[in-house]
């Protein structure tokens, strides 16, 4: 059932990386507009993106209030010129999203190698601790602040002159690895949340190599 010339949204999909979270849906509107509501399982509905012709809605501000909660959203469809109009059941046409738990489901963004420093036969590789939009006490938390020891990084490294890779892991944002003196190495990192069953790994960081500007060398 529904309102004349109004179709329900479909293919509601959560797109979330490092807690930046957008709900997307179809179809592109023809003579209709949308409003989104979001709620936790036990909470009240909050309306967002009022009467929009977009097919996405940024819900980051809502989900960062408690990233461990499970959220449900719904998208209402209204005739473009008559937003008070309701469906035959006396309420606007709407479609529910899948449930979404940010802590368990947000994709891990591509990490960045912040720096590497060589001291003799050791290299310290530091991964940038990316800021998220999750707040605590009016400050934005980093990815490490949010996930703590649940987040690990895997380092891939190899001599510039050979293809054989090595790997190391850390539950901080720093690696201390052994290298051969006089050899240049390249590095790439990947974020992992071992406790997850989906969205466990990020894409690899851009490769950084010794001899480039990010590095520092000391005897």
């Amino acid at each position: 059932s529904g309102t004349t010339n109004t179709v329900a949204a479909y293919n509601l999909t959560w797109k979330s990386t490092n807690f930046k979270t957008i709900l997307e849906w179809e179809p592109k509107p023809v003579n209709q507009v949308y409003t989104v509501q979001i709620s936790t399982k036990s909470g009240d509905w909050k309306s967002k993106c009022f009467y929009t012709t977009d097919t996405e809605c940024d819900l980051t501000d809502e989900i960062v209030k408690d990233v461990k909660q499970t959220y449900l959203a719904r998208v209402f469809s209204y005739p473009a010129g008559n937003v008070e109009s309701t469906g035959s059941a006396g309420e606007p046409l709407y479609e529910n999203s899948p449930e979404f738990t940010p802590y368990l489901e947000t994709n891990l963004g591509q990490p960045t190698i912040q720096s590497f420093e060589q001291v003799g036969t050791k290299v310290n590789v530091t991964v940038e601790d990316e800021r998220t939009l999750v707040r605590r006490n009016n400050t934005f938390l980093s990815l490490r602040d949010v996930f703590g020891k649940d987040l690990i990084y895997t380092l891939y490294y190899w001599k510039s002159s050979s293809s054989g890779k090595k790997t190391a892991k850390t539950n901080t944002n720093e690696f201390l690895i052994d290298v051969d003196k006089g050899e240049n190495y390249c590095f790439s990192v990947q974020a992992v949340i071992p406790s997850r069953t989906v969205n466990r790994k990020s894409t690899d960081s851009p490769v950084e190599c010794m001899g480039q500007e990010k590095g520092e060398f000391r005897e």
Epitope: Y156, K165, K166, A168, K169, T170, V192, R200, K201, D204
Partner: antibody, heavy 117, light 107 residues
């Protein structure tokens, strides 16, 4: 449920090649690191190497680098171990294992390889 | 490469005994140390991960301790079903390396 099933083992002559398979079910291999481990008769466990099936990154114990090759077919959810120039000392049971980054949480039943003339 | 020295290579104990196995790494492995149990003709099974954490479904008589280079695995009260070979594994950096194994028998 999660399962790993190895196949492809058998008797092979020294110098020849063999390709082992590890078919995964109950999860997507691209979400995990996947490993090969072997155990010679009456001996301990020996790590061969790993692959990240999502990006194809492979890491080997240097003693296997160049002679053994780990690969994955994500569409078939299957891991492979290509073993070339086989030697009698490669005789072992070969296991694949899933790595949740804390530990190897699932192992296959193992497939035996015998290198003998 | 990191070497893992596991001891003893074999040990015999009675049901109810406290059993201890040690693994020493050639360098700091930052607790990336797991303990595996392997019974004859079976694949290994994880008992302890990250040096001290008990894997899912593993009885509480198994425990692990240690940090840096020195790690210990303990069975607080040996049971008949604990007859197996036990291995440590460091996975902090490649190549991952297993200890030589400890074969546990009941007297």
């Amino acid at each position: 449920q999660v399962q790993l099933v190895e196949s492809g083992g058998g008797v092979v002559q020294p110098g020849r090649s063999l390709r082992l398979s590890c078919k995964a079910s109950g999860f997507n291999i691209k979400d995990y690191y996947m490993h090969w481990v072997r155990q010679a008769p009456g001996k301990g466990l020996e790590w061969i190497g790993l692959i990240d099936p999502e990006n194809g990154n492979t890491i080997y114990d240097p003693k296997f680098q160049g002679r053994f090759t780990i690969s994955a077919d994500n569409s078939k959810n299957t891991l492979f171990l290509q073993m070339d120039s086989l030697r009698p000392e490669d005789t072992a049971v070969y296991y694949c294992a899933r790595d949740n980054s804390y530990y190897f949480d699932y192992w296959g039943q193992g497939t035996p390889v015998t290198v003998s003339s | 490469d990191i070497q893992m020295t596991q001891s003893p290579s074999s040990l015999s104990a009675s049901v109810g005994d406290r059993v201890t196995i040690t693994c020493k790494a050639s360098q700091d492995i930052r607790k990336y140390l797991n303990w595996y149990q392997q019974k004859p003709w079976k694949a290994p099974k994880t008992l302890i991960y990250y040096a001290t954490s008990l894997a899912d479904g593993v009885p509480s008589r198994f425990s692990g301790s240690g940090s840096g280079t020195d790690y210990t695995f303990t069975i607080s009260s040996l049971q008949p079903e604990d007859i197996a070979t036990y291995y440590c594994l460091q996975h902090g950096e490649s190549p991952y390396t297993f200890g030589q194994g400890t074969k546990l028998e009941i007297t």
